[in-house]
Amino acid sequence: DTEIKVNPPQDFEIVDPGYLGYLYLQWQPPLSLDHFKECTVEYELKYRNIGSETWKTIITKNLHYKDGFDLNKGIEAKIHTLLPWQCTNGSEVQSSWAETTYWISPQGIPETKVQDMDCVYYNWQYLLCSWKPGIGVLLDTNYNLFYWYEGLDHALQCVDYIKADGQNIGCRFPYLEASDYKDFYICVNGSSENKPIRSSYFTFQLQNIVKPLPPVYLTFTRESSCEIKLKWSIPLGPIPARCFDYEIEIREDDTTLVTATVENETYTLKTTNETRQLCFVVRSKVNIYCSDDGIWSEWSDKQCWEGEDLSKKTLLR
């Protein structure tokens, strides 16, 4: 009985299409597949950013795979051919590994890259990113931001920079159609007549960096002799009510009475007849049903009642 062997895939490579971290891994079928003509060959692909402890593993019948990587680091990948037992009339067979790597040759020292990059998607409508210039770079250094997400034909450059002392320190993005719930890739590179500038790469999903507007129309309603209902409305904009969490801060007679997190636009408060003053503020955040993370809004304007019997009326500012 001769042992059945299969070769690894040929021409395994990582291709950078210029999407700032979204790379193509591609290969060709192994040599001498003629013996397995009636056979569906599969490929096991393992890949990771260099320095990562874990490999990502996929099995595919294709000759390519696409995924996102951190281009601040190198990438390594390996692939082998898999034959299920139906191909060999015996046991499953796998080839040796074919391996490849990819990295962008870094220019400049790390200190020259932008510092403290911060991106916020205001009210799920307007993306703004800001940064500080690299350490020790001269005023002739300018930074340029490029971005890409699936749906764009190619990476785009920022067209509305925020400037300080003639340097780009931020970007106001245009309307970004169909850009949430997918990886959003950014590269900030730079140029200087004095010295080369290191590029920086960032990846995030827009729904996870949303800072909503604060809630509006805060009201009080007396529910019973010892209960007051606090109500507010969701802020204007595209974020649906089901996507909000709220934090309320209530002060009774200058003492913090309650801080609470709620999912609805109401909160019922137990009070005493002695209450002379009641104030509350609310802020909002996108909840776990709509994102993995988020940023609290600013606090709403304060809504207060004072000097009248709370039981006598509904209070509306």
């Epitope: 569906t40 996929i58 099995i59 299920p84 037992w85």
Partner: antibody, heavy 121, light 108 residues
Framework: EVQLLESGGGLVQPGGSLRLSCAAS????????MSWVRQAPGKGLEWVSG????????YYADSVKGRFTISRDNSKNTLYLQMNSLRAEDTAVYYC??????WGAGAFDYWGQGTLVTVSS | DIQMTQSPSTLSASVGDRVTITCRAS??????LAWYQQKPGKAPKLLIY???SLESGVPSRFSGSGSGTEFTLTISSLQPDDFATYYC??????????FGQGTKVEIK
Amino acid sequence: EVQLLESGGGLVQPGGSLRLSCAASGFTFRRYAMSWVRQAPGKGLEWVSGISGSGGGTYYADSVKGRFTISRDNSKNTLYLQMNSLRAEDTAVYYCAKVRYGWGAGAFDYWGQGTLVTVSS
Amino acid sequence: DIQMTQSPSTLSASVGDRVTITCRASQSISSWLAWYQQKPGKAPKLLIYDASSLESGVPSRFSGSGSGTEFTLTISSLQPDDFATYYCQQYDTYPPITFGQGTKVEIK
């Protein structure tokens, strides 16, 4: 006749562990990749994990990676799913399924009757 | 991950009707698609594999077609036994293997 018989389901508290078994008969077990697929009450099908015929390749859905371990004992024609750190969202009927053709997963031509796992305090 | 989207979610039909269920993949999966039938309280049953191959023992009124990203399951003449939920599933690239959300075929 191909048969797959799951066992080991039951009620468990959040954070607890269970081990599911699937006894296979009627086919050459060691040759076929196998998978676990679950179905939460009133919901659709969700693939959980797969394993190659030899047991050398194991694959997981992100939702269970690091918590569940698939294994097989080809001498006993049995597939296993060790479930640790269970959560309420793991509540489902768990099916074992035989892969019709392929290395680690594929179309599933035979399914067990399912075993119910309930995670609740 | 490859997403699978089925339509419609629910389909009301009568015995004898020709029924078509559609499954769309978020990227090309060639012909690596299966269709299953599931009845309440029972395990799924394989109907079609490799997009168009009829599983042994499945009535010929079931057929599958399509490749790439668009697939259909057709029941040429709906029978009383066919009222069930149907799922598509891709096995082109994994993990994960992914299923459509299901289409319930109910009596009109």
